[in-house]
């Protein structure tokens, strides 16, 4: 059965997926798709990488981890209820029937109504992290600085993000990371 992840409407959803490249820069093609992993490919592909770069993406879907180190976790921007469902992460290891595939279930909950007058900010702005720019050339990275005016919803989101980060590390530690080579 699929591992389940949750996010609220309007937030960014995070779906973890990792592998360990055999050598630095020795990348393996990866695809993400909406729908359970079929026998080949990723159903309806929303993002893919090749041996060098992110070479295809659709709006709202991106990688903000260091995919060159094997962090191919998917971020879905500003989710709606329609984003609920199963997503496929497929690590396309060359060879005879070598692919590793993971089905991740995303559950979107309605947003909590908060009376706070503060302007809602994307939680990534409140949680410094590396963002990889999308494009066909070399990736550039930038760190977003944290902002002081964070409301309770954002703190809650931040806690969830930290929990998810721990979960991602737990996944790594529990062997969900694929080691290649």
């Amino acid at each position: 059965s699929e591992v389940e992840y949750r996010a609220e409407v309007g937030q960014n959803a995070y779906l973890p997926c990792f592998y360990t490249p055999a050598a630095p820069g020795n990348l393996v093609p990866v695809c993400w798709g909406k729908g359970a992993c079929p026998v080949f490919e990723c159903g309806n592909v929303v993002l893919r990488t090749d041996e060098r770069d992110v070479n295809y993406w659709t709006s709202r879907y991106w990688l903000n981890g260091d995919f060159r180190k094997g962090d191919v976790s998917l971020t879905i921007e500003n989710v709606t209820l329609a984003d609920s469902g199963i997503y496929c992460c497929r690590i396309q290891i060359p060879g005879i029937m070598n692919d590793e595939k993971f089905n991740l279930k995303l559950v979107i909950k309605p947003a909590k109504v908060t009376p706070a007058p503060t302007r809602q900010r994307d939680f990534t702005a409140a949680f410094p992290r590396m963002l990889t720019t999308r494009g066909h050339g070399p990736a550039e990275t930038q760190t977003l600085g944290s902002l002081p005016d964070i409301n309770l919803t954002q703190i809650s989101t931040l806690a969830n993000e930290l929990r998810d980060s721990r979960l991602a590390n737990d996944l790594r530690d529990s062997g969900a990371t694929i080691r290649i080579g």
Epitope: C31, G33, G35, A36, P38, V39, F40, E41, C42, G43, N44, V45, Y56, I86, Q92, I93, P94, G95, I96, M97, N98, D99
Partner: antibody, heavy 122, light 107 residues
Framework: EVQLVESGGGLVQPGGSLRLSCAAS????????MAWVRQAPGKGLEWVAN????????YYLDSLKSRFTISRDNAKNSLYLQMNSLRAEDTAVYYC???????????????WGQGTLVTVSS | DIQMTQSPSSLSASVGDRVTITCRAS??????LAWYQQKPGKSPQLLVY???TLAEGVPSRFSGSGSGTDFTLTISSLQPEDFATYYC?????????FGQGTKLEIK
């Protein structure tokens, strides 16, 4: 117009080898997974093997993977099936088929060749 | 391996009839199911992919439905050219597997 044309079939003795070819035209060959499917006389369809866009990943029916090898040459828009140690039960019409494309989505063999008959008999 | 079981194995019907062929998978294959039509001496032709999407050029009298393990192909009004053998096939698990076929004959 999409076209897939198989060749290389024929009569071969048990234990022999044969190399099937499939010439593709009418589409961007390197954007699609390709497959071989076979059909024994009077029987149903049986999947044999698949290959990804650049040939780096291959997939086989377990019982065939030690004897059959699928490959492709994108520069020649061609798909191949090398069949070794052939047995009587490999007798079938072998079809080349176009499978899923680069962006996924359409899971089914959308186009098929006319087939080439392989007969394994002494 | 995922087994695909079609029923019936053969079926007699008349022009104008509504016909339904079913396909059951031994495991959940979500919507990764295709239907093909094959006439004697000819290559198979894709009718439906992803369980319910009609392939290009296929007449609208054909329709597919289902998800998970149970699927159906329906021909709303049989035409003379529809008498053939029909196969379902799953694209979810390796190896790819086909149903045993349903032979549709003229009554």
């Amino acid at each position: 117009e999409v076209q897939l044309v198989e060749s290389g079939g024929g009569l071969v003795q048990p234990g022999g080898s044969l190399r099937l070819s499939c010439a593709a035209s009418g589409f961007t060959f390197s954007d699609y997974y390709m497959a071989w499917v076979r059909q024994a006389p009077g029987k149903g369809l049986e999947w044999v093997a698949n290959i990804n866009y650049d040939g780096s990943s291959t997939y086989y029916l377990d019982s065939l993977k030690s004897r059959f090898t699928i490959s492709r040459d994108n520069a020649k828009n061609s798909l191949y099936l090398q069949m070794n140690s052939l047995r009587a039960e490999d007798t079938a019409v072998y079809y080349c088929a176009r499978d899923v494309g680069y962006y996924g989505g359409n899971y089914g063999f959308a186009y098929w060749g006319q087939g080439t008959l392989v007969t394994v008999s002494s | 391996d995922i087994q695909m079981t079609q029923s019936p194995s053969s079926l007699s019907a008349s022009v104008g009839d509504r016909v339904t062929i079913t396909c059951r998978a031994s495991d959940n294959i979500y919507s990764y199911l295709a239907w093909y039509q094959q006439k004697p001496g000819k290559s198979p032709q894709l009718l439906v992919y992803n369980a319910k999407t009609l392939a290009e050029g296929v007449p609208s009298r054909f329709s597919g439905s289902g998800s998970g393990t149970d699927f159906t192909l329906t021909i709303s009004s049989l035409q003379p050219e529809d008498f053939a053998t029909y196969y379902c096939q799953q694209h979810y698990g390796s190896p790819l597997t086909f149903g045993q076929g349903t032979k549709l004959e003229i009554k």
